[in-house]
Interface confidence: medium
C-alpha cells in the first residue's frame, strides 16, 4: 500500500502536487509498512479493541487563517476514556479516585509502554531495532526521551505526509509560501505503541485556509456605551477602534503596517500605523466604518531583469514587490541604498486585509457629576443612621435609571446597591437619597442610564456621628 | 542614476490650488514611496505625507489633511502634490523625496527634487 | 507625533574640528537619519537607520544612538561642510524632522 491508500481519499491533481511542496513533507506515493501499521477502514470491528477502557478522540485544530507566506500551526490532542491520563514517564494510567463504568481499578496503568520498551527492545545496544521506525520505514528521532513516546502522529496535506513521534499531544507548523490560497484539508491518523508494532487509534480531519488577505478584526469600545457588542455607539464621544491582526505566526513583525480609516462620516481618510485610533461622532445615524489594512510582507522576488541590450536600455520591471532592505549600506554608486535583486533574496509584496463595519450613533448620557450632597436629618428613633441627598447633574439624553453603589473606602467591599427609575426633566437635575447606616468612610459609585448608556460617577464620603454639629463631607 | 525633476515656481492667490509635479527617472517608480516635504523660507522642514506609486496607498499629515492630494502617474513615473484653499503661509518650497521600499522606517528621503518654490500672494 | 529636539540651533568652528550635534526624540524610534542642507538647494541624506553612510558620503560624518537619544558627528570638519543638519524620522506619521543646526567654519 502506499500513503494516500492508507490516508485520505482526495488525490490532488498533479499540478497541486508539484506547486504546494510542503518543505519537510514527503510524498504520499511513498510505501506504507502496514505490517507494523495495519490499516483499518472506519467500521472495522477491531477499532472497538484499540484502546482498553473505551475510543480515544482526538482533537486537531489550527490557527488558521494563514496568510500566504507566514507558518500555520496545527495542533493534536488526544483525548483519553474517563480516568485514564498520561503520566510522566509516558504511561497511560488511571486517576486516583477516579470511578468510571468499570468502577476503581487495582491495576494503575491503562498501557505501562515503560515496560514493555524495556522488554522488547534488548535486541542491540543502540535501541533502534526495526520495529522504532515510522509507516515509510524512516528511524524514529532519538531525542532525549523519545521512550517515552508512544503515539505516532501521521499528517496528511496536499498530496504529502509528515510522520512525527510525540505524547498525547502534539503541534506541527508547516509554511504556506508554496500553498495554493483557500480552503484545503489535514487529516491526521495516531497510532499506539502494541509491542513491537502499532495500532491505530484515532482519525481527525480539519479544514484550514491560506489567504492572500491579511486577517483583520477590529474591536470597539466607548466610555459610557452600555453594551459594547452591538455597535451601537454614543454621539459626541470618543469610540476607541483597536485592529486586531491575526498573525500568530508573527509574520509580520517587521513589516510597516498601514491602516486607512474611512468612519462614514464625511471626515475623509485617516492613515495610520498606529492599531489604534479613536474617533468622536458628532451626529446620529448610521454610519459605515471602512478599514484597509496594507503591510508589506515576505513574498516571492521578481525575476532578475534581462541583461540592457546595447542600442537601449530595457526598462526595470513596474511591480508591487519591494526589495527587502538590509541595514548595511548599498554598493557604491549614485543610489545611496540601491539594493540588487539576486534570486534568492527576500522581497517584499504589498499586503492587504479589509474590515467593514456598519455602526448606528445615537444619543446617550455622556457625563454625570454630584454637584452637592446634604445631610437630611433623620428622626430620633433611628440614630445610627444617616440619610444624605446627592444632588447630580448630567449631559447628554436624558437617564431613565439611576443606581447607587455604596462600597468600603476602598471601593472594593460593596455594601449596599440600589436601582431605580428615574423622572427627570430636561435640564437634568436630579435629587437622589441614600441611607447610611453608622458613621465613616464610604464609596459611592453613582450611575445613570438609559437603554443605551451608562454613566458613572464616584466620590468618596465621610459620614460623621449624629452629633447635628457635625457637617458632611466629601473625603475626596 | 536616480533623478527627480520637479515642475517650475508658481504664483498663487489665497484660496486658490497649487498641483506640482515630481517625475522620477533611474529606478523602478513603484518600489518605493514618494514624500513631500515643506520648507517656509528660513524655516526648518515639515513633511505633509507620501504616496505609494504601487497603489496609490497615502497618508497625509493631520496638519495638511482635507488640503492635500497625492496622485502618481505610473506610466510616465510621475508623482504630483495637490494643495487646496491656499494661505499666505503655504508660501514656501516643495520638495519631493523618494522614501524607502514600502514606507520602510529605515529608510528616510533618499533622493530629493530640486524644489518648487510657490508663493501665495493678493 | 514624536518631535525632535535638536542641540545646538547653531555652532560655529574651525577647519579640523571635531563637531557633535544631538537629537533628543520624545519618544523612543528605531532610526534615525541626518541630512544637510545648503543655501538655496535640496536635503541631502548623509545618514541612514542610525549609523550607516549613504554611498558618496565622505566618512569623516558618523551617527549613533538608540531609543531617544542619537549624535550626528564630524570628525574632522571641513570648508565644504558649512551648511544647515537636521535630523530626521521616518519611524511614526507623521514624519519629523529636527529644528536644525546651522553649522558655520570660523
Known amino acids: 500500500k502506499r500513503f494516500h491508500d492508507v490516508l485520505g481519499n482526495e488525490r490532488p491533481s498533479a499540478y497541486m502536487r508539484e506547486h504546494n511542496q510542503l518543505n519537510g513533507w514527503s510524498s504520499d506515493e511513498n510505501d506504507w509498512n502496514e505490517k507494523l501499521y495495519p490499516v483499518w477502514k472506519r467500521g472495522d470491528m477491531r477499532w472497538k479493541n484499540s484502546w482498553k477502557g473505551g475510543r480515544v478522540q482526538a482533537v486537531l485544530t489550527s490557527d488558521s487563517p494563514a496568510l500566504v507566506g507566514s507558518n500555520i500551526t496545527f495542533a493534536v490532542n488526544l483525548i483519553f476514556p474517563r480516568c485514564q491520563k498520561e503520566d510522566a514517564n509516558g504511561n497511560i494510567v488511571y486517576e486516583k479516585n477516579c470511578r468510571n463504568e468499570a468502577g476503581l481499578s487495582a491495576d494503575p496503568y491503562v498501557y505501562n509502554w515503560t515496560a514493555w520498551s524495556e522488554d522488547s527492545d534488548g535486541e542491540n545496544g543502540t535501541g533502534q531495532s526495526h520495529h522504532n521506525v515510522f509507516p515509510d520505514g524512516k528511524p524514529f528521532p532519538h531525542h532525549p526521551g523519545w521512550r517515552r513516546w508512544n503515539f505516532i502522529y501521521v499528517f496528511h496535506t496536499l498530496g504529502q505526509y509528515f510522520q512525527k513521534l510525540g505524547r498525547c499531544s502534539v503541534r506541527v507548523s508547516v509554511n504556506t509560501a508554496n500553498v495554493t490560497l483557500g480552503p484545503q484539508l489535514m487529516e491526521v491518523t495516531v497510532y499506539r505503541r502494541h509491542g513491537r508494532a502499532y495500532v491505530p487509534i484515532a482519525q481527525v480531519k480539519d479544514v484550514y485556509v491560506v489567504t492572500d488577505q491579511i486577517p483583520v478584526f477590529v474591536t470597539m469600545f466607548q466610555k459610557n456605551d452600555r453594551n459594547s457588542s452591538d455597535e451601537t455607539f454614543l454621539k459626541d464621544l470618543p469610540i476607541m477602534f483597536d485592529v486586531l491582526i491575526h498573525d500568530p505566526s508573527h509574520f509580520l513583525n517587521y513589516s510597516t503596517i498601514n491602516y486607512k480609516w474611512s468612519f462614514g462620516d464625511n471626515t475623509g481618510l485617516f492613515v495610520s500605523t498606529n492599531h489604534t485610533v479613536n474617533h468622536t461622532y458628532v451626529l446620529n445615524g448610521t454610519f459605515s466604518l471602512n478599514l484597509t489594512v496594507k503591510a508589506a510582507a515576505p513574498g516571492p522576488c521578481p525575476p532578475p531583469p534581462p541583461p540592457p541590450r546595447p542600442s537601449k536600455p530595457t526598462p526595470s520591471l513596474a511591480t508591487t514587490l519591494k526589495s527587502y532592505d538590509s541595514n548595511t549600506p548599498g554598493p557604491a554608486g549614485d543610489n545611496p541604498l540601491e539594493l540588487s535583486r539576486i534570486p534568492d533574496e527576500n522581497c517584499q509584496i504589498n499586503r492587504y486585509g479589509h474590515f467593514q463595519a456598519t455602526i448606528t450613533i445615537v444619543e446617550g448620557i455622556l457625563e454625570v457629576n454630584i454637584i452637592q450632597m446634604t445631610d437630611v436629618l433623620m428622626p430620633v428613633p433611628w440614630p445610627e443612621s444617616s440619610l444624605i441627598d446627592f444632588v447630580v447633574t448630567c449631559q447628554g439624553s436624558i437617564p431613565t435609571e439611576v443606581c447607587t453603589i455604596i462600597s468600603d473606602p476602598t471601593c472594593e467591599i460593596t455594601q449596599n446597591t440600589v436601582c431605580s427609575p428615574v423622572d427627570v426633566d430636561e435640564m437634568c437635575l436630579l435629587t437622589v437619597r441614600r441611607t447610611f447606616n453608622g458613621s465613616g468612610t464610604y464609596c459611592v459609585n453613582l450611575t445613570l442610564g438609559d437603554d443605551t448608556s451608562l454613566a458613572l460617577t464616584s466620590t468618596l464620603i465621610s459620614v460623621p456621628d449624629r452629633d447635628p454639629a457635625s457637617p458632611l463631607r466629601m473625603a475626596n | 542614476q536616480v533623478q527627480l525633476v520637479q515642475s517650475g515656481a508658481e504664483v498663487k492667490k489665497p484660496g486658490a490650488s497649487v498641483k506640482v509635479s515630481c517625475k522620477a527617472s533611474?529606478?523602478?517608480?513603484?518600489?518605493?514611496?514618494m514624500g513631500w516635504v515643506k520648507q517656509r523660507p528660513g524655516q526648518g522642514l515639515e513633511w505633509i505625507g507620501a504616496?505609494?506609486?504601487?497603489?496609490?496607498?497615502?497618508n497625509y499629515n493631520q496638519n495638511f489633511k482635507g488640503r492635500v492630494t497625492m496622485t502618481v502617474d505610473t506610466s510616465i513615473s510621475t508623482a504630483y502634490m495637490e494643495l487646496s484653499r491656499l494661505r499666505s503661509d503655504d508660501s514656501a518650497v516643495y520638495f519631493c523625496?523618494?522614501?524607502?521600499?514600502?514606507?520602510?522606517?529605515?529608510?528616510?528621503?533618499?533622493?530629493w527634487g530640486q524644489g518648487t518654490l510657490v508663493t501665495v500672494s493678493s | 507625533e514624536i518631535v525632535l529636539t535638536q542641540s545646538p540651533s547653531s555652532l560655529s568652528a574651525s577647519v579640523g574640528d571635531r563637531v557633535t550635534i544631538t537629537c533628543s526624540a520624545s519618544?523612543?524610534?528605531?532610526?534615525m537619519h541626518w541630512y544637510q542642507q545648503k543655501s538655496g538647494t535640496a536635503p541631502k541624506l548623509l545618514i541612514y537607520?542610525?549609523?550607516n553612510l549613504a554611498s558618496g558620503v565622505p566618512s569623516r560624518f558618523s551617527g549613533s544612538g538608540s531609543g531617544t537619544d542619537f549624535t550626528f558627528t564630524i570628525s574632522s570638519l571641513q570648508p565644504e561642510d558649512a551648511a544647515t543638519y537636521y535630523c530626521?524620522?521616518?519611524?511614526?506619521?507623521?514624519?519629523?524632522f529636527g529644528g536644525g543646526t546651522k553649522l558655520e567654519i570660523k
Open positions: 523625496t523618494r522614501s524607502g521600499y514600502y514606507g520602510s522606517p529605515k529608510l528616510g528621503g533618499d533622493y
Open positions: 533611474g529606478y523602478t517608480f513603484t518600489d518605493n514611496w
Open positions: 504616496i505609494d506609486p504601487s497603489d496609490s496607498f497615502t
Open positions: 519618544s523612543s524610534i528605531s532610526y
Open positions: 537607520s542610525t549609523s
Open positions: 530626521a524620522q521616518w519611524n511614526s506619521y507623521p514624519c519629523t
